[in-house]
C-alpha cells in the first residue's frame, strides 16, 4: 500500500502568505508572483549572478514537527543556465544549498546561520535557457531529500544562494505514515513511518468483525517501512463459520446458504433434503426422515437409510445355498451401502427355530458385505432355513427401523460327498470321501456306484458305513466311472459328481498311490 503523506509545510499551496525570512534583509531572495501555464504562481527567486560572491539565505517559518520522526522535503525549482547571461556571468552558479535547524521554540526574525546544518547541495537535472515563464520554456526540476530522526518540537528549513539564478516554486515538507489498511481481513492502524531506513516497525493487526485467526495459523502482522509502505504481511484472518468474505469484510451467509467452518471458501447453498437455513447459518438442518452421518461434510445432501434389497433369491445345491439379491431401489442418496446376512433354522418335526450362525459357513463374512451374493454351506439336510438380507448405509444407525428381505429354503439332501482316489493297481482302485461334519450324524451308509467307462448296461454297487472303499476285481488299464452317495433315514442324499479313475496297465506294478 502506498505511503500516506502528512504535509507539514506547503509553500505552493500557501498563496505567498507564509512570509519567509530573507537574509540579508531586502537583498537576495525575493517573493515573486508570476504566471505559469495561465495560472498565477508564487515563487522565491534570486538572480544575483553578476555581482561577485553571494551568500543569500531564505528561511522558512518555524514548522511544528508533531509526531514526525523523519521528514521529506520536496523541492520544485528552476535554475537558469549561467551561459545564457551576458559574458557567461563569471561568478554565476547553478546550485544552491539546503539546510535545516531543529528548535523547541520559534526564534522569529532572529536568524543565526550557525544553528543550521547542511542537508545537501541541490543541483538541477535540467537548466533553463529561456527563462520567461509565460513563454513556457521553463524546465522544472523536482528534488527530494529526507532528514531524521528529528527530536525537537519543530524545525526550520533554509536555502542558501551562492550566486545562482534560481526560482523556488514549491517547497513541500511532509512525513510518511503507513495508512490504515485492511488486508487479509485484518485491520492495521495508521502507523507513523520510522526514521531509520533499515528498520521495519512490526504492527499487529486485528481481525475484522466475524473473522478469526484459523487454528494453528499465525496472528496477522505487517511491517511499516520508512517510506510509509506496508511490507511483509504475516498471518491472516478468515471469516468465521456462517460468514463469507465480501471485499474486505465478513458478511453473514444469506438465508438458504451456510458455511461450516472458518475458511477462505464462500457460503454454499444448502444441499438437497435440508430445511432453508436462517442468515449466518453454519449448517443446514435435515428434512424430516433425512439424516447426516457424523463423518458427512455439511456440504453433503442429507440422506436416509436405503430400502430393502431387491429380488432376493435362495438357490439350494445339496447342503449349500447361494443367496443372490439386487441393490435397493432407493439407496437413500448414499453410496456406502453394505449388506448383512442372518440365518435362522427350523426343525420340521418340532417347528422349533433358532439362529444358525454358529453351524453354517459363509463364503465371506456375512456382515458389511459390499457384493450382492453369498454362498452358505454346511447346511443340515431336512432342515428349513430362513435367510434375512439387510441393507444398511451410513445413516442406518440413526433410525430404529430396518430395511431387509427374507428368503426360505428347505434342505432335503446332504451335501454331495467330496471324492478322492487314494490308490490304484492293475485290478483295484482305493477311493475315499468326506461330507461336512454337521451332516455326518444323519448318514446311515454310503453307496459307491462304479462301472467301466463306455459300458452303460452294467454297473456295480458297494455299500459301506465308512469313508473309504477299495474296489477289486477290476480290469487292468481301464477307466471306471465312480460316484458316491450318502444314504439317510429319509432317503438318498445328493450324489457326488461322477469321477473317472483308471487302473494301472500290466507293465506298471505295485499299488501306487495317486
Amino acid at each position: 500500500a502506498q505511503g500516506k503523506e502528512v504535509v507539514l509545510l506547503d509553500f505552493a499551496a500557501a498563496g505567498g502568505e507564509l512570509g519567509w525570512l530573507t537574509h540579508p534583509y531586502g537583498k537576495g531572495w525575493d517573493l515573486m508572483q508570476n504566471i505559469m501555464n495561465d495560472m498565477p504562481i508564487y515563487m522565491y527567486s534570486v538572480c544575483n549572478v553578476m555581482s561577485g560572491d553571494q551568500d543569500n539565505w531564505l528561511r522558512t517559518n518555524w514548522v511544528y514537527r508533531g509526531e514526525a520522526e523523519r521528514i521529506f522535503i520536496e523541492l520544485k525549482f528552476t535554475v537558469r543556465d549561467c551561459n545564457s547571461f551576458p559574458g557567461g556571468a563569471s561568478s554565476c552558479k547553478e546550485t544552491f544549498n539546503l539546510y535545516y535547524a531543529e528548535s523547541d521554540l520559534d526564534y522569529g526574525t532572529n536568524f543565526q546561520k550557525r544553528l543550521f546544518t547542511k542537508i545537501d547541495t541541490i543541483a538541477p537535472d535540467e537548466i533553463t535557457v529561456s527563462s520567461d515563464f509565460e513563454a513556457r520554456h521553463v524546465k522544472l526540476n523536482v528534488e527530494e531529500r529526507s532528514v531524521g530522526p528529528l527530536t525537537r518540537k519543530g524545525f526550520y528549513l533554509a536555502f542558501q544562494d551562492i550566486g545562482a539564478c534560481v526560482a523556488l516554486l514549491s517547497v513541500r515538507v511532509y512525513y510518511k505514515k503507513c495508512p490504515e489498511l485492511l488486508q487479509g481481513l485484518a485491520h492495521f492502524p495508521e502507523t507513523i513511518a520510522g526514521s531509520d531506513a533499515p528498520s521495519l516497525a512490526t504492527v499487529a493487526g486485528t481481525c475484522v468483525d466475524h473473522a478469526v485467526v484459523p487454528p494453528g495459523g499465525e496472528e496477522p502482522r505487517m511491517h511499516c517501512a520508512v517510506d510509509g509502505e506496508w511490507l511483509v504481511p504475516i498471518g491472516q484472518c478468515l471469516c468465521q463459520a456462517g460468514y463469507e468474505k465480501v471485499e474486505d469484510a465478513c458478511q453473514a451467509c444469506s438465508p438458504g446458504f451456510f458455511k461450516f467452518e472458518a475458511s477462505e471458501s464462500p457460503c454454499l447453498e444448502c444441499p438437497e433434503h435440508t430445511l432453508p437455513s436462517p442468515e449466518g447459518a453454519t449448517s443446514c438442518e435435515c428434512e424430516e426422515g433425512f439424516f447426516r452421518a457424523p463423518q458427512d461434510p455439511a456440504s453433503m445432501p442429507c440422506t436416509r437409510p436405503p430400502s430393502a434389497p431387491h429380488y432376493l433369491t435362495a438357490v439350494g445345491m445339496g447342503a449349500k445355498v447361494e443367496l443372490r439379491w439386487t441393490p435397493p431401489q432407493d439407496s437413500g442418496g448414499r453410496e456406502d451401502i453394505v449388506y448383512s446376512v442372518t440365518c435362522e433354522q427350523c426343525w420340521p418335526e418340532s417347528g422349533e427355530c433358532g439362529p444358525c450362525e454358529a453351524s453354517v459357513r459363509y463364503s465371506e463374512p456375512p456382515h458389511g458385505l459390499t457384493r450382492t451374493s453369498v454362498t452358505v454351506s454346511d447346511l443340515e439336510p431336512h432342515m428349513n432355513y430362513t435367510f434375512t438380507v439387510e441393507a444398511r448405509n451410513g445413516v442406518s444407525g440413526l433410525v430404529t427401523s430396518r430395511s431387509f428381505r427374507t428368503a426360505s429354503v428347505s434342505i432335503n439332501q446332504t451335501e454331495p460327498p467330496k471324492v478322492r482316489l487314494e490308490g490304484r493297481s492293475t485290478t483295484s482302485l482305493s477311493v475315499s470321501w468326506s461330507i461336512p461334519p454337521p451332516q455326518q450324524s444323519r448318514v446311515w451308509k454310503y453307496e459307491v456306484t462304479y462301472r467301466k467307462k463306455g459300458d452303460s448296461n452294467s454297473y456295480n454297487v458297494r455299500r459301506t458305513e465308512g469313508f473309504s472303499v477299495t474296489l477289486d476285481d477290476l480290469a487292468p488299464d481301464t477307466t471306471y466311472l465312480v460316484q458316491v452317495q450318502a444314504l439317510t433315514q429319509e432317503g438318498q442324499g445328493a450324489g457326488s459328481k461322477v469321477h473317472e479313475f483308471q487302473t494301472l496297465s500290466p507293465e506298471g506294478s505295485g499299488n501306487l498311490a495317486v
Partner: antibody, heavy 118, light 111 residues
Framework: EVQLQQSGPELVKPGASMKISCRAS????????MNWVRQSHGKNLEWIGL????????SYNLKFKGKATLTVDKSSSTAYMELLSLTSEDSAVYYC???????????WGQGTLVTVSA | DIVLTQSPASLAVSLGQRATISCRAS??????????IYWYQQKPGQPPRLLIY???NLESGIPARFSGSGSRTDFTLTINPVEADDVATYYC?????????FGGGTKLEIK
C-alpha cells in the same frame, strides 16, 4: 567608495592601436566582473565585452571581436582594453564599468575620449 | 541581440509636471519574476548614472521622484514632478541576455 579611474584622452592615427587603462579601488577587484562600454556621437551606448579579474576569462560582443582585447593586472587592480586597427568609426568615449549587485552597470569610470584622425 | 526601442526620442515637460519615457524590448527580458531592465541618466560630459535597477527598484541616493514599472517587454520611467536638474538624456538597458544592450536614449528638456 567604489572608484574607477581611467587613463586620459587619446588622439591616434587610423590603423594604429592603443590601450586604455582603468584602475579600480574601494572594493575587491577580483570579486567583480569589469565591463567596457563605448559611446559614439555623444549618444549611442554599446557594450564591448567583460573580463573576470579573478581568472582572466573574457567575453566579447561579436561586433567588437578582433577590435578590442581585454586584460587585467591583479597586482595593481587595473583593467586594460587594447583597441586594434583603429578607424574614424572607432572615435568615441570608452567607459570601464563594474557590475552592480543586480546586474546593473552601477559603477562607471569617467570615460576616455579616443579620437582617430589622420 | 535584444533591441530596446525608446520613445519619444526627445521630450519637453514643464517644471512640476510628469515626464514618462517608454522602453520596448524586442523579446522578454524577464527571468523568474525579475525584469532585467535598468534606467540611467546621463548629463553632458559625465558617465551615465544608475537610477532604477530591475525595472522598478530605486538605486540608493536617487530621489523618489524617479520610478520605474513594467515587465516582460514594456517598461516605463516616470519622473514626477520634473525639476530643472532632471534635464539629461535617459537610457534603458537590459542584462537578461548576451550581449547587454541599450536603448537609443530620450532627451528630456524643460518647456
Amino acid at each position: 567608495e567604489v572608484q574607477l579611474q581611467q587613463s586620459g584622452p587619446e588622439l591616434v592615427k587610423p590603423g594604429a592601436s592603443m590601450k586604455i587603462s582603468c584602475r579600480a579601488s574601494g572594493y575587491s577587484f577580483t570579486g567583480y566582473t569589469m565591463n567596457w562600454v563605448r559611446q559614439s556621437h555623444g549618444k549611442n551606448l554599446e557594450w564591448i565585452g567583460l573580463i573576470n579579474p579573478h581568472n582572466g576569462g573574457s567575453s566579447y560582443n561579436l561586433k567588437f571581436k578582433g577590435k578590442a582585447t581585454l586584460t587585467v593586472d591583479k597586482s595593481s587592480s587595473t583593467a586594460y582594453m587594447e583597441l586594434l586597427s583603429l578607424t574614424s568609426e572607432d572615435s568615441a568615449v570608452y567607459y570601464c564599468v563594474r557590475w552592480g549587485d543586480y546586474g546593473s552597470f552601477a559603477y562607471w569610470g569617467q570615460g576616455t575620449l579616443v579620437t582617430v584622425s589622420a | 541581440d535584444i533591441v530596446l526601442t525608446q520613445s519619444p526620442a526627445s521630450l519637453a515637460v514643464s517644471l512640476g509636471q510628469r515626464a514618462t519615457i517608454s522602453c520596448r524590448a524586442s523579446e522578454s527580458v524577464d527571468t523568474f519574476g525579475y525584469s532585467f531592465i535598468y534606467w540611467y541618466q546621463q548629463k553632458p560630459g559625465q558617465p551615465p548614472r544608475l537610477l532604477i535597477y530591475r525595472a522598478s527598484n530605486l538605486e540608493s541616493g536617487i530621489p523618489a521622484r524617479f520610478s520605474g514599472s513594467g515587465s516582460r517587454t514594456d517598461f516605463t520611467l516616470t519622473i514626477n514632478p520634473v525639476e530643472a536638474d532632471d534635464v539629461a538624456t535617459y537610457y534603458c538597458q537590459q542584462s537578461n541576455e548576451d550581449p547587454p544592450t541599450f536603448g537609443g536614449g530620450t532627451k528630456l528638456e524643460i518647456k
